[in-house]
Interface confidence: low
């Protein structure tokens, strides 16, 4: 599923991401834009053999199990396939664990490079939340 901007903002808000660990909703929508272009089925292979999955590009070396990443920790205790669902529950729940891990949203390279320090509220402007 490819979400619309406001559609995703509403879904993320419903799942409790607004101001989760101090990160406003705009940060999460911005991260999703530059990680996956709002596509729940986005996948990208990394040079270390791991793969990033889903709307928030969650990595298989640390956070989920795809059965194909040597040394996977699966800290979210989920199959990576769950992160590709049009239902973003699994991605959101795992993202909450990631953002609580010490580095906050710096765990997402795209957020660090494209969203951090910018007007992230622009990503939810005009949305009926």
């Amino acid at each position: 599923k490819v979400f619309g901007r406001c559609e995703l903002a509403a879904a993320m808000k419903r799942h409790g991401l607004d101001n989760y660990r101090g990160y406003s909703l705009g940060n999460w929508v911005c991260a999703a834009k530059f990680e996956s272009n709002f596509n729940t089925q986005a996948t990208n292979r990394n040079t270390d053999g791991s793969t990033d999955y889903g709307i928030l590009q969650i990595n298989s070396r640390w956070w989920c199990n795809d059965g194909r990443t040597p040394g996977s920790r699966n800290l979210c205790n989920i199959p990576c396939s769950a992160l590709l669902s049009s239902d973003i529950t699994a991605s959101v729940n795992c993202a909450k664990k990631i953002v609580s891990d010490g580095n906050g949203m710096n765990a997402w390279v795209a957020w660090r490079n494209r969203c951090k320090g910018t007007d992230v509220q622009a990503w939810i402007r005009g949305c009926r939340l």
């Epitope: 986005a42 996948t43 053999g49 795809d66 059965g67 194909r68 990443t69 040597p70 590709l84 669902s85």
Partner: antibody, heavy 116, light 107 residues
Framework: QVQLQESGAEVMKPGASVKISCKAT????????IEWVKQRPGHGLEWIGE????????YYNEKFKGKATFTADTSSNTAYMQLSSLTSEDSAVYYC?????????WGQGTTLTVSS | DIELTQSPATLSVTPGDSVSLSCRAS??????LHWYQQKSHESPRLLIK???QSSSGIPSRFSGSGSGTDFTLSINSVETEDFGMYFC?????????FGGGTKLEIK
């Protein structure tokens, strides 16, 4: 239960192209990698590459880049592999398998014969 | 690419014998090693995943061991239905590679 059904045997002329299909049933097709494997007598099993049907992401063994092209149709739960510029070296049995690092489910194989 | 070398190429045994098949990797692959059985004119069948985990429906006489670069598939008291080819496969890195196979035949 999980099943992978491949298309039937093909006899092709050198230089032609062929498209092999693999229809999946019994699981969520879009979220598991489909692998393609070549088997020739005396050459064992060779991994050609893989596709994740839901996203269309593909990864190829360097040896088969330019030879094999993967596609998938999630509406029919079918993966495809096209082999181009066929030569006698492409004569083999081709398998699709569901990829989980290991290959727990395999198609029955498609025999390709390339002959003038 | 990681090379997997299987030995012996052929193993001739009598039903009831116990056998060991070897798979050696050209570099360490941790526990990312899987075993398949293939009978003539059939597709490969997964026997063992991640060195020692049995696939569902596989008889308990099949077991796997090893780590790093040296791995073994053991068959305790071979039955007639066990004859065929055995392949190992690594999933430690891309491209995925298979061993050349060991043919288990009746003596």
């Amino acid at each position: 239960q999980v099943q992978l059904q491949e298309s039937g045997a093909e006899v092709m002329k050198p230089g032609a192209s062929v498209k092999i299909s693999c229809k999946a049933t019994g699981y969520t097709f879009s979220t598991y990698w489909i692998e393609w494997v070549k088997q020739r007598p005396g050459h064992g099993l060779e991994w050609i590459g893989e596709i994740l049907p839901g996203s269309g992401s593909t990864y190829y063994n360097e040896k088969f880049k330019g030879k094999a092209t993967f596609t998938a149709d999630t509406s029919s739960n079918t993966a495809y592999m096209q082999l181009s510029s066929l030569t006698s070296e492409d004569s083999a049995v081709y398998y699709c398998a569901r990829g989980d690092g290991y290959y727990g489910y395999w198609g029955q194989g498609t025999t390709l014969t390339v002959s003038s | 690419d990681i090379e997997l070398t299987q030995s012996p190429a052929t193993l001739s045994v009598t039903p009831g014998d116990s056998v060991s098949l070897s798979c050696r990797a050209s570099q360490s692959i941790s526990n990312n090693l899987h075993w398949y059985q293939q009978k003539s004119h059939e597709s490969p069948r997964l026997l063992i995943k991640y060195v020692s985990q049995s696939s569902s429906g596989i008889p308990s006489r099949f077991s796997g061991s090893g780590s790093g670069t040296d791995f073994t598939l053991s068959i305790n008291s071979v039955e007639t239905e066990d004859f065929g080819m055995y392949f190992c496969q690594q999933s430690n890195s891309w491209p995925r590679t298979f061993g050349g196979g060991t043919k288990l035949e009746i003596k």
